[in-house]
Amino acid sequence: SETTTGTSSNSSQSTSNSGLAPNPTNATTK
């Protein structure tokens, strides 16, 4: 999933993966 939300039962925080594309491709040379 692109974003993780909520907390687990041990009160851990979730890391947000929202800063990165879910299925990234290589940059094209222009």
């Epitope: 993780t4 979730s14 800063g19 990165l20």
Partner: antibody
């Protein structure tokens, strides 16, 4: 409190190997996409490698400059991510940070490649 | 690779005054899902980087709302509405749309 702690850095000769480790706490590690980023005065911040989560089949991505030399891996049971660095070059010198998809960052561990 | 160009290289701001940093990417960062993966990071002296903003304008938890991000496609801006002493450090833009992820060269914010 979220904490990422890197270890394993040090001085290594060109052509040598070293393995970095990052221990995470206070975070749902199994869901986090984990990256290694290095920092040097010359090149600034430079992304090195990424490993994603179980849901994405632990897919890995690498910077071209380290492909075939570095291997990123993770152990969700230990909340740890690793970076195995082989055939090291002087240009691999820098501070290596582990980060949860650029969200949380560790304090970094220094790697110096020199003869 | 996507080249991220930041301006200015450094700026000196009086406490309470605004500050603005520009970041330009060599290609559009708009992803196929309609989202734009442009992040802003802060690195205080002697510390590791810390993300402030993701997806152009979304503030990370605990980040003061004096920070804001805007822009689209290739042109992005980080604004601090009222600079505080704790804001000194280096600010980086970073793109997460295309591999390899790339960072700007950084903008050093100094306090007058």
């Amino acid at each position: 409190e979220v904490k990422f702690e890197e270890s394993g850095g040090g001085l290594v000769q060109p052509g040598g190997s070293i393995k970095l480790s990052c221990a995470a706490s206070g975070v749902t590690f199994s869901e986090a996409w984990m990256d290694w980023v290095r920092q040097t005065p010359e090149k600034g911040l430079e992304w090195v490698a990424e490993i994603r989560d179980r849901e994405t089949k632990y897919v890995t991505y690498y910077a071209e400059s380290v492909k075939g030399r570095f291997t990123i891996s993770r152990d969700d049971s230990k909340s740890r991510v690793y970076l195995q660095m082989n055939n090291l070059r002087t240009e691999d010198t820098g501070i290596y940070y582990c980060t949860g998809a650029m969200d949380y960052w560790g304090q970094g561990t220094s790697v110096t490649v020199s003869s | 690779d996507i080249v991220m160009t930041q301006t200015p290289l450094s700026l000196s701001v009086t406490i309470g005054q605004p500050a603005s940093i520009s970041c330009k990417s060599s290609q559009s960062l708009l992803y196929s899902n309609g989202k734009t993966y442009l992040n802003w990071l802060q690195q205080r002296p002697g510390q590791s980087p810390k993300r402030l903003i993701y997806q152009v304008s979304k503030l990370d938890p605990g980040i003061p709302d004096r920070f804001s991000g805007s822009g689209s496609e290739t042109d992005f801006t980080l604004k601090i509405s009222r600079v505080e002493a704790e804001d000194l450090g280096i600010y980086y833009c970073m793109q997460g749309t295309y591999l390899p992820w790339t960072f700007g060269g950084g903008t050093k914010l100094e306090i007058k």
